[in-house]
C-alpha cells in the first residue's frame, strides 16, 4: 500500500504566439481544478479504460477574473497535493493523466459550467520511494508544470511497496489467532546502498551496488540526460568513436515533430506520434480533440463546425455542458402542470398527476363528475381538479355510498341524548337546555334572554335538526 502524490506547480498559457491570455477571457470569473488518473502499464491505454490504479480530484482553486491589458499570469491554483492511494503493489510502469478543468462562475442557468481545458497523458516508469520527478507538459496552448512521486506507507517498503517490515521495536510474534498476511521482514532494513556516485536525484537501486535510472536519464550513474547522450550530435555514415553506432542523416533528423511528438522513420519519410492534445502530420495542430475522450455521460464526440472548435459533445437527454458533464435538473423547469409531481427517471421524465388531471404532463383537466354519479340522492360538485359529493341526509363518504350515523360525532351538547332519524338527528336535551343541539341554557343567569319557543315546542322538548 502507498500513495501517489502529484504537486501542480503552475498552469498557464504556453510560450509562443496565439497563446490564450486566460482561461476565463470574456466569460467572467472562473477557477481551476485538476483531476489525476492513474492507469497501469506502459502500453497505449485505450481512452475508455478505467483509472485502475486510482484517481483524485483537487479542491477548487481561487476565483480568477481576467484583468484587461494585464500580462497573462500563471493562474491561481488549488492548494495542496493531489493524492491517489493505492492498496496493491505499485506497478512501477504506469500512465499518468492530468486534466485541467475550468469552472465558470458567471450567471449560468443551472449553476456553474465545467469544461475541460487541457489533458496531458504520459507513460512513465517510477519506483516507489524515489525522489520527486519534475515534468513540464504542453496541452494545446497551455503549459503545465508539475512534480510527482510514489511512496509506500509502513509497514510496506520497497520499490513496489510489496515487502512488509516490522520496526525493530515491534514484538516479533503475531498475537493470538493472527498470522502474517504477507512475508514479513523481521526488522525494517536500511535502504540498499547504491553504486558509488549514483545520482541521488535521477537514480535509484533495489539491490546493493546497482544504479537504475529514472525516466529521461541514462549513463552508469544516471547523470546524463537522454537528449544529450554522447551518441548524439555525431554525423557521417556511422561513427564508433564513442562506442555508439550513429546512422547518417535521416528523415527524423532535427525532429520534425512539434509539441513533444516522437518521430519514427518510415520508408522514405517519417511519422510523428503526437502527445494527447496535438495532432496533424507534425503534431502542429493543438487542442483537445475527440481522440482525447473529452465527453462524459454517454455524450458522443464529433468534430466542431468551425476550425476553432476541435470537438463537440452531443449529450444524451439529462446532461449538458461542453463535455456533457452537468446533469440537467429537468424537473426544475416544472414540466408537470396543475400541481403534478415531477419524477426524473434518468431515461425519461414522469409526472404523477393530482386527482382530476391526466396526460404526460398532467395537462388534461378531467370532467370529474362524468361517470361519477353520487349515490343515494347526492349531488356532484366539481372544483379544483377534484370532485366531491354533497350527500343527502343520512349518507356520507366520497360517493355517498356509506350510510351515515348522524349521532357518531356526539352532536348534542350538555348531556343531551341523540336519536337518529330518517332525515337527520334529533337531540333530546337535558333539563335546563334547549336548541337544535341543546346548546342554549333555558335561563342563563336566571334571565330568559331567548326568544319564545316556536309554537308546539316547549323548552326541554326534543327538537329536530332541520
Amino acid at each position: 500500500a502507498g500513495v501517489f502524490e502529484l504537486q501542480i506547480h503552475s498552469f498557464g498559457p504556453g510560450p509562443g504566439p496565439g497563446a490564450p491570455r486566460s482561461p476565463c477571457s470574456a466569460r467572467g470569473p472562473c477557477r481551476l481544478f485538476f483531476r489525476v488518473c492513474l492507469k497501469p502499464g506502459l502500453s497505449e491505454e485505450a481512452a475508455e479504460s478505467p483509472c485502475a490504479l486510482g484517481a483524485a480530484l483537487s479542491a477548487r482553486g481561487p476565483v480568477y477574473t481576467e484583468q484587461p491589458e494585464a500580462p497573462a499570469p500563471d493562474l491561481p491554483l488549488p492548494n495542496g497535493l493531489l493524492q491517489v492511494p493505492f492498496r496493491d503493489a505499485w506497478p512501477g510502469t504506469f500512465s499518468l493523466i492530468i486534466e485541467t478543468w475550468r469552472e465558470e462562475l458567471g450567471d449560468q442557468i443551472g449553476g456553474p459550467a465545467w469544461s475541460l481545458l487541457a489533458r496531458v497523458t504520459r507513460r512513465r516508469r517510477l519506483a516507489a520511494g524515489g525522489p520527486w520527478a519534475r515534468d513540464i507538459q504542453r496541452a494545446g496552448a497551455w503549459e503545465l508544470r508539475f512534480s510527482y512521486r510514489a511512496r509506500c506507507e509502513l509497514p510496506a517498503v520497497g520499490t513496489a511497496c510489496t515487502r512488509l517490515c516490522r520496526p525493530r521495536s515491534a514484538p516479533s510474534r503475531c498475537g493470538p489467532g493472527l498470522r502474517p498476511c504477507a512475508p514479513l521482514e523481521d526488522e525494517c532494513e536500511a535502504p540498499p546502498v547504491c553504486r558509488a556516485g549514483c545520482s541521488l536525484e535521477h537514480g535509484f537501486c533495489e539491490q546493493p551496488g546497482e544504479c537504475r535510472c529514472l525516466e529521461g536519464w541514462t549513463g552508469p550513474l544516471c547523470m546524463v540526460p537522454v537528449s544529450t547522450s554522447s551518441c548524439l550530435g555525431l554525423r557521417g555514415p556511422s561513427s564508433t568513436t564513442t562506442g555508439c553506432l550513429v546512422p547518417g542523416p535521416g528523415p527524423c533528423d532535427g525532429n520534425p515533430c512539434a509539441n513533444g511528438g516522437s518521430c519514427s522513420e518510415t520508408p522514405g519519410s517519417f511519422e510523428c506520434t503526437c502527445p494527447r492534445g496535438f495532432y496533424g502530420l507534425r503534431c502542429e495542430v493543438s487542442g483537445v480533440t475527440c481522440a482525447d475522450g473529452p465527453c462524459f455521460n454517454g455524450g458522443l464526440c464529433v468534430g466542431g463546425a468551425d476550425p476553432d472548435s476541435a470537438y463537440i459533445c452531443h449529450c444524451p437527454p439529462g446532461f449538458q455542458g461542453s463535455n456533457c458533464e452537468k446533469r440537467v435538473d429537468r424537473c426544475s423547469l416544472q414540466p408537470c402542470r396543475n400541481g403534478g409531481l415531477c419524477l426524473d427517471l434518468g431515461h425519461a421524465l414522469r409526472c404523477r398527476c393530482r386527482a382530476g388531471f391526466a396526460g404526460p404532463r398532467c395537462e388534461h383537466d378531467l370532467d370529474d363528475c362524468a361517470g361519477r354519479a353520487c349515490a343515494n340522492g347526492g349531488t356532484c360538485v366539481e372544483g379544483g381538479g377534484a370532485h366531491r359529493c354533497s350527500c343527502a341526509l343520512g349518507f356520507g363518504g366520497r360517493n355517498c355510498r356509506e350510510r351515515a350515523d348522524p349521532c357518531a360525532a356526539r352532536p348534542c351538547a350538555h348531556g343531551g341524548r341523540c336519536y337518529a332519524h330518517f332525515s337527520g338527528l334529533v337531540c333530546a336535551c337535558a333539563p335546563g337546555y334547549m336548541g337544535a343541539r341543546c346548546e342554549f341554557p333555558v335561563h342563563p343567569d336566571g334571565v330568559s334572554a331567548l326568544p319564545a319557543a316556536p309554537p308546539g315546542l316547549r323548552p326541554g322538548d326534543p327538537q329536530r335538526y332541520l
Epitope: 475527440c290 455524450g299 468534430g303
Partner: antibody, heavy 121, light 107 residues
Framework: QVQLQQPGAELVKPGTSVKLSCKAS????????ITWVKQRPGQGLEWIGD????????NNNEKFRNKATLTVDTSSSTAYMQLSSLTSEDSAVYFC??????????????WGQGTSVTVSS | DIVLTQSPVTLSVTPGDSVSLSCRAS??????LHWYQQKSHESPRLLIK???QSISGIPSRFSGSGSGTDFTLSINSVETEDFGVYFC?????????FGAGTKLELK
C-alpha cells in the same frame, strides 16, 4: 467477453416489415450506444443510425429516416431495428455494433455477425 | 456528406511485403478517422481509431497516420491472415460515412 448476437437470416416479402434483433452481453448494455450498419452484397458499409439504450435517444442517417426505426429493450439487453415497406433495395446484411462511447469515442469496437435480409416474393 | 475515397481498389501482395492503404476525405475530418478490416463472410473488426491509436488485441504491424483529409493505414510485413477488405470511417460529422474499401489479396 463482449458479444452481439444477431439471427443469421430473414426472408421477407416486398411491402412488409421486418424487425431485426441484436442481443448484447459481456458489458453494461445501457452505457454504450448501439449502431446499425447496412452492407449490400459486394459493396461498402452504410451507417443507418445509433441508439442510446438508457434513454432511447437516436441519431439517424436522413437516408434511412423513413425506413428504419431503432428501439431497445433494456431488460433483455437487446437492440432492435425495424425496417418497413421493404423492397429489393433493402436486401443486404445488417450489422449491429457497440460504440465505445466512453470519453465520447464514436468508434465501433465490437460487431455482431450480421443478419442477412432477403426481400423476395 | 463527407465522401471517403480509398485507393487502390485492390492491392495484390505477397506475405512479408509492407503496404500502405490510402483514404482521402472530401473535406477535413480532423483526426476523427478509423480503420476496419473485414474478411470474407465475417463482420468488420476495428484496427485503428482516431488515425493512429492502437486497439488492444490488434497486432503491432498495423499502424495509422495522417490528418485533415489524407490518411494512411500501414501494414508492416503482411501475414496471410491479413488478406481481406479494409475500410476507413469518419466520425467527424453526421452522417457517419465509410470508404468503399481496399481489397488486399494474395499475389
Amino acid at each position: 467477453q463482449v458479444q452481439l448476437q444477431q439471427p443469421g437470416a430473414e426472408l421477407v416479402k416486398p411491402g412488409t416489415s421486418v424487425k431485426l434483433s441484436c442481443k448484447a452481453s459481456g458489458y453494461t448494455f445501457t452505457s454504450h450506444w448501439i449502431t446499425w450498419v447496412k452492407q449490400r452484397p459486394g459493396q461498402g458499409l452504410e451507417w443507418i443510425g445509433d441508439i442510446y439504450p438508457i434513454s432511447g435517444s437516436t441519431n439517424n442517417n436522413e437516408k434511412f429516416r423513413n425506413k428504419a426505426t431503432l428501439t431497445v429493450d433494456t431488460s433483455s439487453s437487446t437492440a432492435y431495428m425495424q425496417l418497413s415497406s421493404l423492397t429489393s433495395e433493402d436486401s443486404a446484411v445488417y450489422f449491429c455494433a457497440k460504440i465505445i462511447t466512453v470519453g465520447g469515442a464514436y468508434v465501433m469496437d465490437y460487431w455482431g455477425q450480421g443478419t442477412s435480409v432477403t426481400v423476395s416474393s | 456528406d463527407i465522401v471517403l475515397t480509398q485507393s487502390p481498389v485492390t492491392l495484390s501482395v505477397t506475405p512479408g511485403d509492407s503496404v500502405s492503404l490510402s483514404c482521402r476525405a472530401s473535406q477535413s475530418v480532423r483526426n476523427n478517422l478509423h480503420w476496419y478490416q473485414q474478411k470474407s463472410h465475417e463482420s468488420p473488426r476495428l484496427l485503428i481509431k482516431y488515425v493512429s491509436q492502437s486497439i488492444s488485441g490488434i497486432p503491432s504491424r498495423f499502424s495509422g497516420s495522417g490528418s485533415g483529409t489524407d490518411f494512411t493505414l500501414s501494414i508492416n510485413s503482411v501475414e496471410t491472415e491479413d488478406f481481406g477488405v479494409y475500410f476507413c470511417q469518419q466520425s467527424n460529422s453526421w452522417p457517419l460515412t465509410f470508404g468503399a474499401g481496399t481489397k488486399l489479396e494474395l499475389k
